[in-house]
């Protein structure tokens, strides 16, 4: 005699997260009397998804009108699919009884969920580093499925090769995460540079996701100092300039020392920006040489971005006539400062 068969025609179904999944199931007979139930998984821990007889299943609708006379189609639609819904779904016929008893199960349909990876987040080192140093950047993206994914690193459009990538977990999971670390060698020209992490996945239809990090957040370009003596502005007055060049970031404090004694301290304000993103700044000092019997050692001391101070000194000869002193001209005087010393 022919006995009821539970037919699940689809071995597997793949659905994008957020969409609805249709799981097909038909039975070949209306006997025995009893409900169809859908489960995710098998065995004692299986999860009830739908019960024709009773219960409230807000995400599940029957494709056919299950109350319709002669209905043998017990396909269901599950709305708003998430990666957590992945698994094997079984359509099971129960026989009416006290309690109902399982009569026959379908072969199962494996539901896989295609979930987009989250936007890659790129993070750099906690502390700034100087050119010629190698720094590490990490890129993370989460929540994607299936597991296959491609990650690439770029610096200013040039693909990087020095990186390591892991996809977790290693075994089966409803969704996956990717973590990659790239090593980047800094150069003095990197203030405007960008590091890009690019993630490609089947759910993105060839339009990869990108995460970026600006090297301006990572790099510190220490300044170069040049102290020069300018032509005399007035009798017995000498103009000494300290040119602070090619530094980044802008945070900079300059101190003038006269024979080792602090003469004045100032903070870089009106700076000029170079094409490469670094800054220049100039400070000057007006020295009244008639107030000095001996030679004067003038020191320009710069503390940049909280780093140990660097300095450059200039010896000012008071015996010589001021007009005969050095004749270097400042290349820039934008944002200059002047102070007389008496």
């Amino acid at each position: 005699e022919e006995e009821l068969q539970v037919i699940q025609p689809d071995k597997s179904v793949s659905v994008a997260a957020g969409e609805s999944a249709i799981l097909h199931c038909t039975v070949t007979s209306l006997i025995p009397v009893g409900p169809i139930q859908w489960f995710r998984g098998a065995g004692p821990a299986r999860e009830l998804i739908y019960n024709q007889k009773e219960g409230h299943f807000p995400r599940v609708t029957t494709v056919s009108e299950s109350t319709k006379r002669e209905n043998m189609d017990f396909s269901i639609s599950i709305s708003n699919i998430t990666p957590a819904d992945a698994g094997t779904y079984y359509c099971v016929k129960f026989r009416k009884g006290s309690p109902d008893t399982e009569f026959k199960s379908g072969a199962g349909t494996e539901l896989s969920v295609r979930a987009k990876p989250s936007a890659p987040v790129v993070s750099g080192p906690a502390a700034r580093a100087t050119p010629q140093h190698t720094v590490s950047f990490t890129c993370e993206s989460h929540g994607f499925s299936p597991r296959d994914i491609t990650l690439k690193w770029f610096k200013n459009g040039n693909e990087l090769s020095d990186f390591q990538t892991n996809v977790d977990p290693v075994g089966e999971s409803v969704s996956y995460s990717i973590h990659s670390t790239a090593k980047v060698v800094l150069t003095r020209e990197d203030v405007h540079s960008q590091v890009i992490c690019e993630v490609a996945h089947v759910t993105l239809q060839g339009d990869p996701l990108r995460g970026t990090a600006n090297l301006s957040e990572t790099i510190r370009v220490p300044p170069t100092l040049e102290v020069t003596q300018q032509p005399v502005r007035a009798e017995n007055q000498v103009n000494v300039t300290c040119q602070v060049r090619k530094f980044y970031p802008q945070r900079l404090q300059l101190t003038w020392l006269e024979n080792g004694n602090v003469s004045r301290t100032e903070t870089a304000s009106t700076v000029t920006e170079n094409k490469d993103g670094t800054y220049n700044w100039m400070s000057w000092l007006l020295v009244n040489v008639s107030a000095h019997r001996d030679d004067v050692k003038l020191t320009c001391q710069v503390e940049h971005d909280g780093q140990p101070a660097v300095s450059k000194s200039h010896d000012l000869k008071v015996s010589a006539h001021p007009k005969e002193q050095g004749s270097n001209t400042a290349a820039e005087n934008t944002g200059s400062n002047e102070r007389n010393i008496y």
């Epitope: 007979s29 209306l30 006997i31 409900p35 009773e54 009416k96 009884g97």
Partner: antibody, heavy 115, light 111 residues
């Protein structure tokens, strides 16, 4: 889709009687056939349902008094040892209740048990 | 075993009127909805009207409606017609597959 009963007649008490339900327009591999009777001046009374071999069952009062069997197009109900209380019109209907209600029904066949 | 008590045994109604018959189960029917209503006229086979407590069978006029759940069920005929004169039976199903029991019937007389 239709069902029709046959085999009703006058029998003496204790003489086994087999009623036949002949179906057309649907398959007996997909549908159960239920039997209901109505004694003169009384209401309807459910007897049992015949499906596949393992899915044949009778109301508690009918167990032992009736048996069932089927072929590809017919379903038999056997009254094993009729008594006068079994005098009734016997109906067969497609269906086995709950979401598979009894429909359609045959016109009925009259069984009279009398000595 | 399930017992189905149907009331009233008989009711008369004028054409265009409303008729109600009730069925009470001794315990909750299977799935709270294993209840069908049948119309039976003398010399004819019974006819399915309602199943699963409230689902109208194919071809049955919409003046017939069923309601209820668990142990209490009602068949209502709104706008009774002369052709509705018949005996109406409820059939309840218990938790066991063989536990199908008819109510005693309600005779509807149309004046």
């Amino acid at each position: 889709r239709s069902v029709e009963e046959s085999g009703g007649r006058l029998v003496t008490p204790g003489t086994p009687l087999t009623l036949t339900c002949t179906v057309s327009g649907f398959s007996l591999s997909s549908h159960g056939i239920s039997w209901v009777r109505q004694a003169p001046g009384k209401g309807l009374e459910y007897i049992g349902t015949i499906g596949t071999g393992v899915i044949t069952y009778f109301a508690s009062w009918a167990k032992g008094r009736f048996t069932g069997s089927k072929t590809s197009t017919t379903v038999d109900l056997k009254i094993t040892s009729p008594t006068t209380e079994d005098t009734a019109t016997y109906f067969c209907a497609r269906g086995s209740a709950w979401n598979d209600p009894f429909d359609p029904w045959g016109p009925g066949t009259l069984v009279t048990v009398s000595s | 075993a399930l017992v189905m008590t149907q009331t009233p045994a008989s009711v008369s109604a004028a054409v265009g009127g409303t008729v109600t018959t009730k069925c009470q189960a001794s315990q909750s029917v299977y799935g709270n909805n294993d209840l069908a209503w049948y119309q039976h006229k003398p010399g004819q086979p019974p006819k399915l009207l309602i199943y699963l407590a409230s689902t109208l069978a194919t071809g049955v006029p919409s003046r017939f409606s069923g309601s209820g759940s668990g142990t209490q069920f009602t068949l209502t005929i709104t706008g009774v017609q002369s052709d509705d004169a018949a005996t109406y039976y409820c059939l309840g199903g218990g938790d066991d597959e063989a536990d199908n029991v008819f109510g005693g019937g309600t005779e509807v007389v149309v004046k």
